[in-house]
């Protein structure tokens, strides 16, 4: 038995931030689980981890330097990534492992989400031209 995961095919991070929602064919209520987001076709980089446990607060962390937060729904985990760089444009995959109560369950590999990071406009806006020279 495998959990199915649905993700948006593509998201654009205009302000270097994005919300990526991972929707699961499984209710995470009262389960102990580890949801993670992985970068690259080979899922080589673990971007963010959300660890859920019946007795503790949700733990969210990145061991790879990403600025991330996570939010839990009954059948979803939403990853909020901030301070993304243009060169972090890539495909991102949701992964889920449910450990307790048994049996252990993980997911079929999803199709992934292409996150396209658009660079911030660094030019001054015409409405706010910046300080004028004396």
């Amino acid at each position: 038995n495998k959990i199915l995961v649905k993700q948006s095919p593509m998201l654009v991070a205009y302000d270097n931030a994005v919300n990526l929602s991972c929707k699961y064919s499984y209710n995470l209520f009262s389960r102990e689980f580890r949801a993670s987001l992985h970068k690259g076709l080979d899922s080589a980089v673990e971007v963010c981890v959300v660890y859920g446990n019946y007795s503790q607060q949700l733990q969210v962390y990145s061991k790879t330097g990403f600025n991330c937060d996570g939010k839990l729904g009954n059948e979803s985990v939403t990853f909020y990534l901030q301070n993304l760089y243009v060169n972090q444009t890539d495909i991102y995959f949701c992964k889920i492992e449910v450990m307790y109560p048994p049996p252990y369950l993980d997911n079929e590999k999803s199709n992934g989400t292409i996150i396209h990071v658009k660079g911030k406009h660094l030019c001054p806006s015409p409405l706010f031209p910046g300080p004028s020279k004396p």
């Epitope: 019946y54 492992e97 450990m99 109560p101 048994p102």
Partner: antibody, heavy 118, light 111 residues
Framework: EVQLVESGGGLVQPGGSLRLSCAAS?????????WSWIRQAPGKGLEWIGD???????YYNPSLKSRVTISRDNSKNTLYLQLNSLRAEDTAVYYC???????????WGQGTLVTVSS | DIQLTQSPSSLSASVGDRVTITCRAP??????????LHWYQQKPGKAPKLLIY???NRATGIPSRFSGSGSGTDFTLTISSLQPEDFATYYC?????????FGQGTKVEIK
């Protein structure tokens, strides 16, 4: 028939580290079960140390999490336990075991004794 | 952690006796109709051996004199007619929640 054979036990100095091996035969460690390390202090009960899942994910007892690493070498069909900053109370027989789908331990190795003493 | 309490801690019995060991959890270890409670036998100098899994299922090769029962918080291991090879220590284990925990053991000795 699944067989598990632990090795690497012996006398270790306090503050030192241990690295134990568990060679599995009769079953591939990547074939869908989970593999655990459990220990038993002399004359005491059983304590679960942690697991490595068939996916490669690891999972540890919070009481030992900061000092323990479980890994595997798929090509050798072998599991490993690394335990750091050893103290006298880590003296125990260390077992590796296979977990079934509902996390009962259905196969065990013979155990290897680790003694932490100066 | 779920701390399992076994009783008695030790008992003396004779060959042919009916022996009952109990294991109590502070909260239910059931989920969706299944009990995540298992029983092991350990002889001196040997690894534990799985006897009963999921509260009442005998593991492969375990004689029918061993049986398990119970649900929720209270579980029982019964040896219907004690044999000489049954003198050992018995442990219960829960796998409902992490960390996995074991009872403190019940030593069955010869009277």
């Amino acid at each position: 028939e699944v067989q598990l054979v632990e090795s690497g036990g012996g006398l270790v100095q306090p503050g030192g580290s241990l690295r134990l091996s568990c060679a599995a035969s009769g079953y591939s460690i990547t074939s869908g079960h989970h593999w655990s390390w459990i220990r038993q202090a002399p004359g005491k009960g059983l304590e679960w140390i942690g697991d490595i899942y068939h996916s490669g994910s690891t999972y540890y007892n919070p009481s030992l999490k900061s000092r323990v690493t479980i890994s595997r070498d798929n090509s050798k069909n072998t599991l490993y336990l690394q335990l750091n900053s050893l103290r006298a109370e880590d003296t125990a027989v260390y077992y590796c075991a296979r977990k079934d789908d509902y996390y009962a331990f259905d196969y065990w190795g013979q155990g290897t004794l680790v003694t932490v003493s100066s | 952690d779920i701390q399992l309490t076994q009783s008695p801690s030790s008992l003396s019995a004779s060959v042919g006796d009916r022996v009952t060991i109990t294991c109590r959890a502070p909260q239910s270890v059931d989920f969706h109709g299944k009990s995540f409670l298992h029983w092991y036998q350990q002889k001196p100098g040997k690894a534990p051996k799985l006897l009963i899994y999921d509260a009442s299922n005998r593991a492969t090769g375990i004689p029918s004199r061993f049986s398990g029962s119970g649900s929720g918080t209270d579980f029982t291991l019964t040896i219907s007619s004690l044999q000489p090879e049954d003198f050992a220590t018995y442990y219960c284990q829960q796998s409902y929640r992490s960390p996995i925990t074991f009872g403190q053991g019940t030593k069955v000795e010869i009277k």
